[in-house]
Interface confidence: low
């Protein structure tokens, strides 16, 4: 016997309290699937949520965060405050990058300079606390009276805080 | 079903540590947000502390900002706070929770009490 | 962060209506829950997103959430309700509050 209910369309639901007709949805609520037996509460964007897409009846509300938060979360579930490139948001607010570490973006953690000599190679461009470092060729490619930039000394930069 | 088991409380002299931990199951314990709420004997709820999934970014009451560290093992499911310099009026009995706010699905661990005397 | 004030206490006579409020500066562009908390146990979530309501909570449980007063409304209270109730206002952000608590007296 087939389910009466699996005729009702996404933005409808089977009402049971009408005999199984297929009731729209009522306001503030949606059904994305066909069959449904009730329809889900669309989802409020408030707070430093804002709305990046209308409820309907068929598709649930999302939303993204107001300008200074950026989504953290399957969905956006939270929001997270911005920091500026050069620093990292920790348990006492956005801090600046320490020496050695950079980060190019308004979000995550501060990350090590690229080591070059690792890789053979040399530091062309030195790293600051919004960019990694630029690794050039390594010096026995380097032609006779070329050189490279030389890497900064193990100081603390001005304007580093320790962590 | 989600089932969320703290441990560690006890008797602890001012200025000691001790170390909490919640053990989780029912769940996949990486995708969530991981919250730790206490409450002092006849008072209300106050909230302490949250830790991202990966562990990357922690968050803190200003009440416990500098002594406390909330961390988590997602290897394990467990979830930990590692209390130091403990004071009498952080007596309370602390809860796990997963905390969802907006959506259907905040439970709480039963509580493990910690109290601080000397 | 936002105050919540609730009232200590709330009593109310078996099957009427108990309202619980929770005001904080403009907590109505903010989402709040409601946890129901029963001497000895955790918290139990009876409200969350204002006015929804968990899977298991009884239909007597509402809330609704504007200006600055959230609301928890529990019509035909029963002897099984009293409690400690607790509002929690979130605005999206990472760190939670919590309200001072109210004690439902069924008298």
């Known amino acids: 016997l087939q389910d009466p209910c699996s005729k009702c369309p996404a933005g409808t639901f089977c009402d049971n309290n009408r005999n199984q007709i297929c009731s729209p949805c009522p306001p503030n609520s949606f059904s994305s699937t066909s069959g449904q037996k009730a329809c889900d509460i669309c989802r409020q964007c408030k707070g430093v949520f804002r709305t990046r897409k209308e409820c309907s009846s068929t598709s649930n509300a999302e939303c993204d965060c107001t300008p200074g938060f950026h989504c953290l979360g399957a969905g956006c579930s939270m929001c997270e405050q911005d920091c500026k490139q050069g620093q990292e948001l920790t348990k006492k607010g956005c801090k600046d990058c320490c020496f050695g570490t950079f980060n190019d973006q308004k979000r995550g953690i501060c990350r090590p300079w690229t080591n070059c000599s690792l890789d053979g190679k040399s530091v062309l461009v030195n790293g600051t606390k919004e960019r990694d470092v630029v690794c050039g060729p390594s010096p026995a490619d380097l032609s006779p009276g070329a050189s490279s930039v030389t890497p900064p000394a193990p100081a603390r930069e001005p304007g580093h805080s320790p962590q | 079903q989600v089932q969320l088991v703290e441990s560690g409380g006890g008797l602890v002299q001012p200025g000691g540590s001790l170390r909490l931990s919640c053990a989780a199951s029912g769940f996949t314990f990486s995708d969530y947000y991981m919250h730790w709420v206490r409450q002092a004997p006849g008072k209300g709820l106050e909230w302490v502390s949250v830790i991202s999934g990966s562990g990357s970014n922690t968050y803190y009451a200003d009440s416990v900002k500098g002594r406390f560290t909330i961390s988590r093992d997602n290897s394990k499911n467990t979830l930990y706070l590692q209390m130091n310099s403990l004071r009498a009026e952080d007596t309370a009995v602390y809860y796990c929770?997963?905390?969802?706010?907006?959506?259907?699905?905040?439970?709480w661990g039963q509580g493990t009490l910690v109290t601080v005397s000397s | 962060d936002i105050e919540l004030t609730q009232p200590p206490s709330v009593s109310v006579a078996p099957g009427q209506t108990a309202r619980i409020s929770c005001s904080g500066d403009?907590?109505?562009?903010?989402?709040v829950s409601w946890y129901q908390q029963k001497p000895g146990q955790a918290p139990v979530l009876v409200i969350y997103s204002d006015s929804e309501r968990p899977s298991g909570i009884p239909e007597r449980f509402s809330g609704s959430n504007s200006g600055n007063t959230a609301t928890l409304t529990i019509s035909g209270t029963q002897a099984e309700d009293e409690a400690d109730y607790y509002c929690?206002?979130?605005?999206?952000?990472?760190?939670?509050?919590f309200g001072g608590g109210t004690k439902l007296t069924v008298l």
């Open positions: 929770a997963r905390l969802y706010a907006q959506f259907e699905g905040d439970f």
């Open positions: 929690q206002s979130w605005d999206g952000s990472i760190s939670r509050v």
């Open positions: 403009n907590i109505g562009s903010k989402y």
